[in-house]
């Protein structure tokens, strides 16, 4: 039985040209996280963090995606096209797969706030 829950930064907004942290956190389970996948709204993979192999950033995003903090992902040099859904997929043993969703809105406005429900140090 899957007992864990994924908390995410939820709906966030950030300025065009700026950067944003996408963060998921798995709690309420003792399952071991073996891999985390980060996907964009069109299901294209941005990055994978494997427990043994470490981070792999996919070539199309190499210039604009930085690994971390933790199992999160930092998107840089944001464009309006970055608006949309992002998914973290946690592969865990022995629970299986947990999935979290974040909605990012990229704003032209200089008053855009990067609001997050929580931040992991």
């Amino acid at each position: 039985m899957m007992t864990g829950t994924i908390e995410t930064t939820g709906n966030i907004s950030a300025k065009k040209g700026g950067s944003v942290i996408l963060q998921c956190h798995l709690s309420s389970t003792m399952a071991q996280v073996t891999q985390v996948n980060w996907e964009q709204h069109d299901h294209s993979l941005l990055a994978i963090r494997n427990a043994e192999l470490g981070w792999h950033i996919y070539p199309a995003f190499k210039d604009r995606v930085a690994p971390g903090p933790g199992l999160g992902l930092t998107l840089q040099s944001l464009t309006m096209n970055d608006t949309g859904e992002y998914f973290c997929t946690y592969h865990t043993y022995p629970d299986g797969t947990y999935r979290g969703r974040i909605f990012l809105e990229v704003l032209e406005s200089s008053v855009a706030e990067h609001s997050a429900r929580f931040q992991i140090p």
Partner: antibody
């Protein structure tokens, strides 16, 4: 190359305790979950449970919650199985086995097994 | 808990025969199923994982298939060295239990 090397056979009296070790080499112990499997003489494989090698937290299958303890010493890359208050029915070969961390799990490396015999 | 029922528990076949072992799950386990071979006096070794993926170094005469909650291990042409007991295992959730085993004897 990846290896799991277990401690040697043990002969114990009922009521005694035993600690079986599983020395991991050729990979980073803390990246891969570790499992323990029991095989009584002439019987099949029983999954006893596993230990989260990242946090050190153990989880036990239903029949192994009472007298069985999984632990780790990451400084010597070794997993341990301790059984207390031994009974004759604990006589078995005990295996440690590593969970492969592909997205579809399986036990890709096994120790050679440790025979624990409980007899008065 | 999800139960695995493996059949047959014993089979005897001749060298060159096609051998099929079945494992039924009491509920859906997706493709989280592995097959192991255990030769007498030895530790088990994985043959198939993810229901159908052949482990590196395992002869291609071994194959796995799935249909709903029924999983099959097939040995296309039995060899003398295939004398062993074969186990299925579910890995979709705790407990990661094994089937009862199938002992394969060479006629």
């Amino acid at each position: 190359q990846v290896q799991l090397v277990q401690s040697g056979s043990e002969l114990k009296k009922p009521g005694a305790s035993v600690k079986v070790s599983c020395k991991a080499s050729g990979y980073t112990l803390t990246n891969y979950p570790m499992n323990w499997v029991r095989q009584a003489p002439g019987r099949g494989l029983e999954w006893m449970g596993w230990i989260n090698t990242n946090t050190g937290s153990p989880a036990y299958a239903q029949d192994f919650t009472e007298r069985f303890v999984f632990s780790l010493d990451t400084s010597v890359t070794t997993a341990y199985l301790q059984i207390s208050s031994l009974k004759a029915e604990d006589t078995a070969v005990y295996y440690c086995a590593r969970t492969a961390i592909t997205s579809v799990y399986h036990f890709d490396y096994w120790g050679q097994g440790t025979l624990v015999t409980v007899s008065s | 808990d999800i139960q695995l029922t493996q059949s047959p528990s014993f089979l005897s076949a001749s060298v060159g025969d096609r051998v099929t072992i079945t494992c039924r799950a009491s509920q859906g386990i997706s493709s989280y199923l592995a097959w192991y071979q255990q030769k007498p006096g030895k530790a088990p070794r994985v043959l198939i994982y993810g229901a159908t993926t052949l482990q590196s170094g395992v002869p291609s005469r071994f194959s796995g298939s799935e249909s709903g909650t029924e999983f099959t291990l097939t040995i296309s042409s039995l060899q003398p060295e295939d004398l062993a007991t074969y186990y299925c295992q579910k890995l979709n959730s705790h407990p990661c239990s094994f089937g009862q085993g199938t002992k394969v004897e060479i006629k």
